[in-house]
Amino acid sequence: MAPWPELGDAQPNPDKYLEGAAGQQPTAPDKSKETNKTDNTEAPVTKIELLPSYSTATLIDEPTEVDDPWNLPTLQDSGIKWSERDTKGKILCFFQGIGRLILLLGFLYFFVCSLDILSSAFQLVGGKMAGQFFSNSSIMSNPLLGLVIGVLVTVLVQSSSTSTSIVVSMVSSSLLTVRAAIPIIMGANIGTSITNTIVALMQVGDRSEFRRAFAGATVHDFFNWLSVLVLLPVEVATHYLEIITQLIVESFHFKNGEDAPDLLKVITKPFTKLIVQLDKKVISQIAMNDEKAKNKSLVKIWCKTFTNKTQINVTVPSTANCTSPSLCWTDGIQNWTMKNVTYKENIAKCQHIFVNFHLPDLAVGTILLILSLLVLCGCLIMIVKILGSVLKGQVATVIKKTINTDFPFPFAWLTGYLAILVGAGMTFIVQSSSVFTSALTPLIGIGVITIERAYPLTLGSNIGTTTTAILAALASPGNALRSSLQIALCHFFFNISGILLWYPIPFTRLPIRMAKGLGNISAKYRWFAVFYLIIFFFLIPLTVFGLSLAGWRVLVGVGVPVVFIIILVLCLRLLQSRCPRVLPKKLQNWNFLPLWMRSLKPWDAVVSKFTGCFQMRCCCCCRVCCRACCLLCDCPKCCRCSKCCEDLEEAQEGQDVPVKAPETFDNITISREAQGEVPASDSKTECTAL
């Protein structure tokens, strides 16, 4: 779980902790500004009680009529109704709609392409390092190391299919056992969920949108982490995945099938291959300890090559090293044998931007990483804007009702399972869970899909990506068929087990609650989203990796106390909220801990100090650019600051938000105003001249 933001008192508590709740008027506050006042202001103060904390959310004390931030926003249609339009208006509106649809599809196309290029960029930057992770011999004996290697490699190459294909090739060539491969597959499952979390970061501009988007993205993370938390120990103890999949593989006489259909790649490849083309075999070769591969570039230069097989005479130290006894001879001094050598003749160069630059992989990767993130961000902003303008009024109502409404009683429970099937089907079509979940993220952000509905869709996506892997396995060559199929089935049954753990019973849907909690923290402290990303996808795996390299004793020596502390904190929180009377007075709340250990506020101050300087410069630059642009387009009205500058200005006014711990996991209520959300329409004026 994410670190706690604010840990309040447990109830009942004789020494009630009281804090001033500033700015709480029964009337609706001005929405054009955040009203974050500090505790020492002379505003009317309402004494509020800090209740026990159940989740990782920070709450605001507010009037009784509350606005649940998790409720989907009502997208008001400010335009003229269809019936009120004249023929010209209707035609214009129709063509506007068509134009918007084309634009939406266009941006969606470039969004998917940028995800593909982002993956390539990550492979260029960290692919070789990822390959070297695999060449670690301890993977065989240490499942925890296997898990973190799976996470790190998938994060570095931004593609679970790349990491699983490396695992498959290693199993096929007996460098890895299926038993050792299972934790890596589990790790790959976790690693692949970083993509949509990165996409969610792009929606940081609007707090309300960001809360939903980030929670919607991290629901995938939490599902994967929790599944691993439960299923990895179970697998280590029972080897159930290995046994089940082995039985399946052995009981069926599989024939080599067709390749999984590349539906989305057919459309995106013509564009992405003009940007960059990679030789992904290099990563696999590094993973398989091929020394020559370490000096090879991942950037593909030659696309058309002619392979000529020839036999050459080579000397060998002894006759035992001969290819075969019949292909062994001597010249009287040395022993000779005949080796098959493949000569690769380059015929035609690839047609992509970087083919003639001969830049190092890191340089190409960095360029592509920046560009793909910019395109990703731009496309996402435009998709959200277009969807925002399209999904208004009646259209939004219909779509939201269709997606989020359950089947009538008594079949309501079936809706989620249908969503799982839809998620699986859609992922199968687009051939990538990253693409599907990343496309889902902005829809959650703008409030078209609820997190409760996004959750089964994401779970379905996890299943969909494994069915693709199963089909790909069936198309493998003879020697790799068994291993690749077994690994694909392990992946499949791991996700099925995870769904059985965290979906059927509503009470067990912990990922939703955890994601909402994280969404709340990240909406208030937006830096925490990046912190979460670094901690969960880099620091924790790297720490475990480092400790594993140091040996079992070190790993256990450090790991056991850490796990013990986490369990202790969780048990203490549970007792504080459920039955605080059994605890000594001191432990009924978290006040015995220093503030920095129970609140993110001190950390926020530190982060703000670090980022303040950069933010100021950024905004100054932003203002200069903006004003120059306004002068050029002769539009004085359009010169408004960006959201980051508004936040900075408001922060400088020195306002703060009084906090209150949540009473339950569910029904978390945070007022939009107190959380500092400003509707997009209020903060931006459209430039008519542009």
Epitope: P325, S326, C328, W329, D331, G332, I333, Q334
Partner: antibody
């Protein structure tokens, strides 16, 4: 043309040593292996060992190991074969033979042979 | 060491006859076999290497075949100048070994 010229006939007493020389011409001396093959009167051919003049690497027949020594002098393009602790059964014609068919043990150029007689 | 057993040890044939000499290796030598001709009082001369490759200047009536352990040297049409002792040799393993030789005579 390739020519291998060997030293003259030798008569030795048992227990003594003999050093036969073989001077090569007509090809790049250091490139090809030089073999030594002996043939006892009315008998078949017997391979004694080989030397690679380029590096001086040698390989001997286990039967002669410890008794035979092959050396070369690149300045004179000459190969030497010394056989010690001579016995009467060492009486034979000693041939030096060059293998210009690269990477094979088939010898295509032969010296005229040196008759070594071991007699008390 | 690999033993090379040649048969027959001697043979007599008429001019124009097809003559076949066989050589058997004690273990697999692949195709690393050479054939030599040694005329009386002369030095050996390479005829064939790699089982079947004729050395430069060797007449086409000489041919070789076989692989593994069984090898054959064939003189398709015996000529008076072919009177000699023929040796097979393996160069699959050190030490290189020769067959006992086959003496060919004209009837």
């Amino acid at each position: 043309q390739v020519q291998l010229v060997q030293s003259g006939a030798e008569v030795k007493k048992p227990g003594a040593s003999v050093k036969v020389s073989c001077k090569a011409s007509g090809y790049t001396f250091i490139t090809y292996n030089m073999h030594w093959v002996r043939q006892a009167p009315g008998q078949g051919l017997e391979w004694m060992g080989a030397i690679y003049p380029g590096s001086g690497d040698t390989s001997y027949n286990q039967k002669f190991k410890g008794r035979v020594t092959m050396t070369r002098d690149t300045s004179t393009s000459t190969v030497y074969m010394e056989l010690s602790s001579l016995r009467s059964e060492d009486t034979a014609v000693y041939y030096c033979a060059s293998s210009t068919i690269i990477t094979t043990g088939a010898v295509d150029y032969w010296g005229q042979g040196t008759l070594v007689t071991v007699s008390s | 060491d690999i033993q090379m057993t040649q048969s027959p040890s001697s043979l007599s044939a008429s001019v124009g006859d097809r003559v076949t000499i066989t050589c058997k290796a004690s273990q697999d030598v692949g195709t690393a076999v050479a054939w030599y001709q040694q005329k009386p009082g002369k030095v050996p001369k390479l005829l064939i290497y790699w089982t079947s490759t004729r050395h430069t200047g060797v007449p086409s009536r000489f041919s070789g075949s076989g692989s593994g352990t069984d090898f054959t040297l064939t003189i398709s049409s015996l000529q008076p100048e072919d009177v000699a002792t023929y040796y097979c040799q393996q160069y699959s393993r050190i030490p290189l070994t020769f067959g006992g030789g086959t003496k060919v005579e004209i009837k």
